[in-house]
Every structure is written in C-alpha cells, then in structure tokens.
C-alpha cells in the first residue's frame, strides 16, 4: 500500500509571442483546480477506461481576476498535493492524465461553470520510495510544470511497496533469517505479514498482504465458515471432507466497496457502484460536492453546495453511474431491428443493416419488389428482406422465367392422370372421382358428395361441413 503524490508547480501560458489571454477576466473571475487519473502503465485498456490505479481532485486555487492589458502570468494554484492512495503493489510503470479545470465564478444561473483548460498525459516508469520526478508539458497554448512520486505507507517498503519492515526488537541485529531494511537500517525486514485481520487459525499467506483460506473457511479474512448445507458456489477446489466446492475468495467477498457501494464482479476484478456523494475505485472518496467537479465524461453537476446536500450528475449520452464514470453498453439494449449489427462508436450508435433493410435502426423494410419484375404474369411478394415471385401456372423459378412442368407436383388426386396442356394441365380422373383435380368422389346414385376432408383430418373425424 502507498500513496502517489502529485505537486503542481505552475500552470501558465507557454513561451513565445502567441501566449494565450488569461482564462479569467474582471467580469468573470475564476479559479483553477486539477484532476489526476492513474492507470497501470502497460494495461491494454482503452483510453477511456476508468482510472484503475485511482484518481484525485485538488482543492480550488485562489480566485484570480485578470489585470487588463497585462499578459497572463502563471495562474495561482491550489495549495497542497494531489494524493492518490493505492492499496496493492505499486506497478512501477503507470499512465497518467492530468486535467486543468477552470471554475468561473461569475453570475451563472445554477452555480459555477467548469471548463477544461488543458489535459496532459504520459506513461512513465517510477519506483516507489524514489525522489520526486519532474515534468514539463505543453497543452495547447498552456504549459504545465509538475512533480510526482510514489511512496509506501509503513510498514510497506521497496520499489513496489510489497516488502514489509518493522522496528528492530534487538538493538544489534535482526531476527533469524531476516535482513535489515535498506534504506532504513534501524529496521528489519518483517516476517511475511498477511492481510490485516487475517484469521491466524483459518487463514495463511504466501505473499504479503494476502489472506488465503484453509478448507472450510471463506471471506476476505477467512473468518466465515463455509456452509455445507447448500453447495452452490462453484469457486475453488473441492473439499474432501464435505464433498462440496469450497469457495475461494472472490473479488467481491467481504464487499471491498466502502460507504454502501455495491460490488459486482468483472472478468478481471470487481467494480463498485457508489452511492451519491462517494466515488473512487472503492467509493472511498467522500464529502463530495459539485465544487469538486465529481461528474466525469462531461456530466453536468446539479445540487450540493455543501457536503451535506448531495449532488446529481446528469450524464451525457453513452455514460451512466452516479458520477457518469461508466460507459453504457448501448448495444446491450439491442436497438438494431431486423437482425442489424450494432456498433457503439462512443460518440454515436450505428446499425449495420442486413440486405433489404435500412434506416438508423434498420427499421425500414426496403420495397423488395421495387424494380423487380416477375415474368410471364407472375406477381411479386415481399418478405424478409428478399423478394419472391408467385408464378402463373406453367412457370417457375426465381423470376418465373422457367417453363414449369405443371404435372411435376402430381396435382391430380385419387390416382387421376395428369396431362400437360398449353393452358395448364388436365386431370383424367380414376373411376368414382370427378372435379378439375379429381378431388370429389362420385356417389352411386349420381349425386356428388361434399368436398373430402381437408388435409390433416382423417376420414371418420367428427367434422361437419356446412
């Protein structure tokens, strides 16, 4: 565990004659604040992915009013450091985004207005416990100077904050098998220390800070007995004693989300959905008001001028969450109709339509028959994004261009014989049947019966024909 610290030294116009005008004016006094977002440096995540290592907002800087006619100087800065605590090991290589925001303090209706003045980004290698690293970056017409470092929180030490140190118990040397803790020679490398609170009876660790459970126990600190009555959880190795699957610690076990946040597992880790007033990887940042600019991705903040009154973020399309921090999977709503393929481009949603369909959501069934003639008197029938011809007697094929054998479908019932004829077909009926298709039986007295039962009804079914 440890803290990443960022110190902003100056923010002002870059060199050269094209220096920008001050972002504040006598009519619109303003003040600056900064936001930092950290990600593990070698992660393959998209640019808009969350700040997996953490994020922080600075306090507001002093109010600044432009002096008319004077060039914009370096602008007054907030006091103090921006601090981003990290709970696990420091990754060594990290990516950062630092944003400079302007808060206008004029007579805006609905409170102050914010606008992004500059954004810089980079990927750096940084060992925890090392000296401050300095940087100078240009962003548009502005120049930002800053320093940063990562430091471990005791008892963690080392370049990744994974080694643990304790004060010496004896003045002369460390215990058996334990080395002095460079650079803190008066301290000793501690024996492996499991996660704080890890049950000494039911838990153990192979890495500092972890807590692995013995069979039959679960929870982040291995204090929860596994229920043997309902063996529902498929996580972890099988228990020989119970025959049940013993759950290994899942990312949401013990709910890592603070302040009433709800935890949901993700393929790699977990995600906290924070209640209003809290945010951060584990909902650990609190006392937030609109003055802290808590709405990400262009969300509009409304409400809360003091920490006791909550704020609401109105998110732009494509984002959700109490701080607009989550990108909406808008394709999960299946907006594309008629089998269209959904593409979420971030700024817009696109549907790639199947043949025969069009429109923003593939909602329009194209006139399949437009310009599609069916030959030889056939009629066009629309359907399913493709056209079909219903052909006149004696013709077949997709466009009714093929001369059909009218007798191929054996149209003459009850053993009647079929003859092809220029006008269609003729049935020569077997004795006892009559009709164009030999479909009616002839009664011995010469009267014809009602039509035979339609397909699907067996003779003798109690079916009356009227």
């Amino acid at each position: 565990a440890g803290v990443f610290e960022l110190q902003i030294h100056s923010f002002g116009p870059g060199p050269g004659p094209g220096a920008p005008r001050s972002p504040c004016s006598a009519r619109l006094p303003c003040r600056l604040f900064f936001r930092v977002c950290l990600k593990p440096g070698l992660s393959e995540e998209a640019a808009e992915s969350p700040c997996a290592l953490g994020a922080a907002l600075s306090a507001r800087g002093p109010v600044y009013t432009e002096q008319p006619g004077a060039p914009a100087p370096d602008l007054p800065l907030p006091d103090g450091l921006l601090q981003v605590p990290f709970r696990d090991a420091w990754p060594g290589t990290f990516s950062f985004i630092i944003e400079t925001w302007r808060e206008e303090l004029g007579d805006q209706i609905g409170g102050p207005a914010w606008s992004l003045l500059a954004r810089v980004a980079g990927r750096r290698r940084l060992a925890a416990g090392g000296p401050w690293a300095r940087d100078i970056q240009r962003a548009g017409a502005w120049e930002l100077r800053f320093s940063y470092r990562a430091r471990c929180e005791p008892p963690a030490v080392g370049t990744a904050c994974t080694r643990l140190c304790r004060p010496r118990s004896a003045p002369s040397r460390c215990g058996p098998g334990l080395r002095p803790c460079a650079p803190l020679e008066d301290e000793c490398e501690a024996p492996l220390v499991c996660r704080a609170g890890c049950s000494p009876e039911h838990g153990f660790c192979e890495q500092p800070g972890e807590c692995r459970c013995l069979e039959g126990w679960t929870g982040p600190l291995c204090t929860v007995p596994v229920s043997t009555s309902s063996c529902l959880s498929p996580r972890g190795p099988s228990s020989a004693t119970t025959g049940c699957l013993v759950p290994g610690p899942g990312p949401c076990d013990g709910n890592p989300c603070a302040n009433g946040g709800s935890c949901s597992e993700t393929p790699r880790s977990f995600e906290c959905t924070c209640p209003r007033g809290f945010y951060g990887l584990r909902c650990e940042v609190s006392g937030v008001t609109c003055a802290d600019g808590p709405c990400f991705n262009g969300g509009l903040c409304v409400g809360g001028a003091d920490p006791d009154s909550a704020y609401i973020c109105h998110c732009p399309p494509g984002f959700q969450g109490s701080n607009c921090e989550k990108r909406v999977d808008r394709c999960s709503l299946q907006p594309c109709r008629n089998g269209g393929l959904c593409l979420d481009l971030g700024h817009a949603l696109r549907c790639r339509c199947r043949a025969g369909f069009a429109g923003p959501r593939c909602e329009h069934d194209l006139d399949d028959c437009a310009g599609r003639a069916c030959a030889n008197g056939g009629t066009c029938v629309e359907g399913g994004g493709a056209h079909r011809c219903s052909c006149a007697l004696g013709f077949g094929g997709r466009d009714c261009r093929e001369r059909a054998d009218p007798c191929a479908a054996r149209p003459c019932a009850h053993g009647g014989r079929c003859y092809a004829h220029f006008s269609g077909l003729v049935c020569a009926c077997a004795p006892g049947y009559m009709g164009a298709r030999c479909e009616f039986p002839v009664h011995p007295d010469g009267a014809s019966a009602l039509p035979a039962a339609p397909p699907g009804l067996r003779p003798g079914d109690p079916q009356r024909y009227l």
């Epitope: 060199p15 985004i97 980079g122 290698r125 300095r134 940087d135 100078i136 240009r138 548009g140 120049e143």
Partner: antibody, heavy 117, light 107 residues
C-alpha cells in the same frame, strides 16, 4: 531571442570519447530541459536523453545508458554531452534541443561527429 | 518503445497543392504527437505539438489532427519553402521516438 549554439565538428577514433557543448541564451537557462538527439547520415532522428539544469537529473535512452554522460554549467548556461567507447555507427550529427517532455521547441545547429580509424 | 510509421516515405507535389502526411503509432499515445520540418543541413524545426497545436511563428497553412494512434499533418497550399523532410515524434512514453520521415519533393 532563444538560441542554442553548439561546439564544432569532431573526428574521433573508435574507443575514444567525445564531449559536445551546447550554450543557451535568450531565456532563463534553468527553466527548460536540454535534450540530445542524433541523426546518422541519411537516417532518422534518435533521442539520446535529457538533463534538467535545475536538478541535474538526467534520463537516457537505454540504447546509450552506459556510454552517455550529461552535465551542465549554470554560470555559462552550457550543457555538455559526453559519449564514450565510440564506434563507427556513432558517426552522426548531434543536436541539443530545449524543451519539456512533450516538445523540443528550439534546436542547436548540430555538431558533426565522425568516428573513423 | 513505441513505434511510429510515417507514410508516404516520399512525396512529389507542386506549389499550391494540398498535401497530407500520416503517422501511425503502435499503441495509443493520446494526443502526444509533434511534427517537425527539416531542411538539408539544418536542424529540425517544431511545427505542431500535442497533435494539433501550431507552434508560434509557423504559418497557418500547416495543421495537425488526430489522437490515439492515427495522426495527420496537412499543408493546405504548398509554398516553395515547404519542400523538406517531415518527421513525427511521440512524447507519450520514454524514450520519445520519431517516425522514419517523409521527404516532400517538387514535382
């Protein structure tokens, strides 16, 4: 106006060292870093490293890490780049440039270093 | 190190033409891309930084665009003094790296 003036051309033998100077003027010397970039004949540009004149902190491209040294003299606003264990492939034009981490806004005129036995 | 691929490697054009040079990064570099112009026997000169910011004193016919992995340098109307070699440079990661260059010649 901002100017970076470099020392003259050098001819060196393989295994020797070369020290190139870059004198800055027209701005506050400690306000910006000085980077070194080289360009082999007919080739592209290769960043070697930089020095922060305020803190004397240096960072190098790992390709040069064990052979390059950068120093500065604030009294004369001059930065020095020394490259040791020279080989024929170090024959190049060496440039100093003022800047930060994401811009090199003013460049020296270049110093030609020829390594030949 | 991040690789930058410039295209085309050489280009013939006439005065007054609109010319576009592209630079593709091997991974996302956000907007940390600069463009430099170099004439024979001279040091490179900064034209554009942070993808689209025009350096002081550079004519407005030069413009830059793009973010992430794909970037473009456009010269809206070529002037005789624009015939040179152009390099892109990423500054997202250390070490900064340069593209292979695009040589712009008179047709």
């Amino acid at each position: 106006q901002v100017q970076l003036v470099q020392s003259g051309a050098e001819v060196k033998k393989p295994g020797a060292s070369v020290k190139v100077s870059c004198k800055a003027s027209g701005y506050t010397f400690t306000r910006y870093w000085i980077h070194w970039i080289r360009q082999a004949p007919g080739q592209g540009l290769e960043w070697m490293g930089y020095i922060n004149p305020t803190t004397v902190y240096t960072e190098f491209n790992h390709n040069f890490k064990d052979r390059v040294t950068m120093t500065r003299d604030t009294s004369t606003s001059t930065v020095y780049m020394e490259l040791s264990s020279l080989r024929s492939e170090d024959t190049a034009v060496y440039y100093c440039a003022r800047g930060g981490s994401n811009f090199f806004d003013y460049w020296g005129q270049g110093t030609t270093v020829t390594v030949s036995s | 190190a991040i690789q930058l691929t410039q295209s085309p490697s050489s280009l013939s054009a006439s005065v007054g033409d609109r010319v576009t040079i592209t630079c593709r990064a091997s991974e996302n570099i956000y907007y940390n891309l600069a463009w430099y112009q170099q004439k024979p026997g001279k040091a490179p000169k900064l034209l554009i930084y942070t993808a689209n910011s025009l350096e002081d004193g550079v004519p407005s016919r030069f413009s830059g665009s793009g973010s992430g992995t794909d970037f473009t340098l456009t010269i809206s109307s070529l002037q005789p003094e624009d015939f040179a070699t152009y390099f892109c440079k990423q500054a997202y990661d250390v070490p900064p790296t340069f593209g292979g260059g695009t040589k712009l010649e008179i047709k």
